[in-house]
C-alpha cells in the first residue's frame, strides 16, 4: 500500500568509518523525495536531510553526540511537489534501517605510519593517532581517546629483498622491532579492536619502506 507513484525506500545501509556515518538507501527517486529521521532506542525522532532527492544522508552530527548508544533511522518517501501527501494509513510511506551501534560497528579507518627511525639493529615505528569526528570540549578526539585499551595496532614488516612477513602488536602507537643491520625493511600497520565481533580490523596502511623520506637512520 502507499501513495500513488511513491515507493518505499529499501536496502537501508549504514556506512561508517571512524564515526563518520552515512545512511544509504535505494531506489534513485523518480518523482519522489525523501526525509530521514534518526532516534536512539529511548529518544525522540529527529528529522534530517529534508525532502532530498539524494539516496544518502550524513548522520554523523547525530551519532557523535553519543557513540555508545544504539540508533535506528527511517526513510520517508513523499511524492515530489506534494510532500503533504500520505499513504493509505494516513502516514507517509517509510522504511526502518537496521539498528546501528557506532562504538561496536563503525569501521576503523586506514591507519598511517607517521614515522620510523632506525638505531642500529632496532627500528621504532610510530603510527599516527587518527582523529575521529567525536568531540569533547570542542576538540576532536583521537581513536585512542574513544576506544582506549580496546584499540591495538598490528605491524607487518618484511625485508625489501624478500616476501616473508613478520608481525608485531602494540597497545600503544609505537613498535620497537629488531632488524638485520644493512637490510632495508618495509612496513604496514593495521588497527584492530580485538573485543569486537564485526569490523574488527582496518584496512592495511600504505606501505612505507626504509630508504624513503619518512624514515631516519642513526648508527
Amino acid at each position: 500500500s502507499g501513495t500513488t507513484n511513491t515507493v518505499a525506500a529499501y536496502n537501508l545501509t549504514w556506512k561508517s568509518t571512524n564515526f563518520k556515518t552515512i545512511l544509504e538507501w535505494e531506489p534513485k527517486p523518480v518523482n519522489q523525495v525523501y526525509t530521514v529521521q534518526i532516534s536512539t532506542k529511548s529518544g525522540d525522532w529527529k528529522s534530517k536531510c529534508f525532502y532530498t532527492t539524494d539516496t544518502e544522508c550524513d548522520l554523523t552530527d547525530e551519532i557523535v553526540k553519543d557513540v555508545k548508544q544504539t540508533y535506528l533511522a527511517r526513510v520517508f518517501s513523499y511524492p515530489a511537489g506534494n510532500v503533504e501527501s500520505t499513504g493509505s494509513a494516513g502516514e507517509p510511506l517509510y522504511e526502518n534501517s537496521p539498528e546501528f551501534t557506532p562504538y561496536l560497528e563503525t569501521n576503523l579507518g586506514q591507519p598511517t605510519i607517521q614515522s620510523f627511525e632506525q638505531v642500529g639493529t632496532k627500528v621504532n615505528v610510530t603510527v599516527e593517532d587518527e582523529r575521529t569526528l567525536v568531540r569533547r570540549n570542542n576538540t576532536f578526539l583521537s581513536l585512542r581517546d574513544v576506544f582506549g585499551k580496546d584499540l591495538i595496532y598490528t605491524l607487518y614488516y618484511w625485508k625489501s629483498s624478500s616476501s616473508g612477513k613478520k608481525t608485531a602488536k602494540t597497545n600503544t602507537n609505537e613498535f620497537l622491532i629488531d632488524v638485520d643491520k644493512g637490510e632495508n625493511y618495509c612496513f604496514s600497520v593495521q588497527a584492530v579492536i580485538p573485543s569486537r565481533t564485526v569490523n574488527r580490523k582496518s584496512t592495511d596502511s600504505p606501505v612505507e619502506c626504509m630508504g624513503q623520506e619518512k624514515g631516519e637512520f642513526r648508527e
Epitope: 561496536l104 585512542r144 602507537n173
Partner: antibody, heavy 120, light 113 residues
Framework: EVQLVQSGAEVKKPGESLRISCKGS????????IEWVRQMPGKGLEWMGD????????NYSPSFQGHVTISADKSISTAYLQWSSLKASDTAMYYC?????????????WGQGTLVTVSS | DIVMTQTPLSLPVTPGEPASISCKSS????????????LTWYLQKPGQSPQLLIY???TRSSGVPDRFSGSGSGTDFTLKISRVEAEDVGVYYC?????????FGQGTKLEIK
Amino acid sequence: EVQLVQSGAEVKKPGESLRISCKGSGYTFITYWIEWVRQMPGKGLEWMGDILPGSGSTNYSPSFQGHVTISADKSISTAYLQWSSLKASDTAMYYCARSGYYGNSGFAYWGQGTLVTVSS
Amino acid sequence: DIVMTQTPLSLPVTPGEPASISCKSSQSLLYSGNQRNYLTWYLQKPGQSPQLLIYWASTRSSGVPDRFSGSGSGTDFTLKISRVEAEDVGVYYCQNDDTYPMTFGQGTKLEIK
C-alpha cells in the same frame, strides 16, 4: 540515571560453586565494559577482570585467570562473576563497576558490592 | 604487571589544610599518540563503594569538587586537596588505566586530626 545493582550477600562452604550478578540500567549496556574488583577484609582494591557485553569479550588479571569466570547476558543487562570451587581465601567484598564514556577514563559507576563469605 | 606505589599510606590532616598524595608507576602511563596519561584516582569513603575522582591524571569526574586536582606525567603523579573537609575522609587509590591488568595502588588513608 546509571545504576549497577548487585546480588545479595552469600555464605558458602569451601568447594561449593557460586555466581553473583550485577544488573546495569540507565545506559546502553552492550557498549560499556563491566569491571570486577575484589576487596578482601581490611585490604585494598584488586582488579579481577572485565567483559564487554556487546561481544562477550573478556580480560582477566593473571592473579584470577582460571579461578573465576566472567560472563554477561545482554538480554537482561546483567553481568556475572562465578566460581566453580570456592576457597576460604575468596572471602571478600566484590564490586562491579562500569567503564567511563571515553577510552581509559576509569570506572565511572560502581555497584554497592556483594559480600562473599566462605567458611567451613 | 605495572606496579603502583602510593605515599604516604596514612595521612592525618587538619580540616581546612591542604593534602597531597603521591603515586608512582613502574612503567610510563603516558600515551604518546595523544599525550594523555592513563592514571585514575578513586576515593572509598568508610562503608561505601569506591567513587571516581579523576581520570586522565588531571580530569575531574563530573560532580567532583574543584578542591580536588590531579597532576603529573609519565610515572609520577599527585592528587591534591586544596582544603580538606571532614567528608573527604577515606582511602584514596590510584590506578593504572593504561594496560591490562589494571593495577591499583595500595591506598592512602586520609583521616582528620
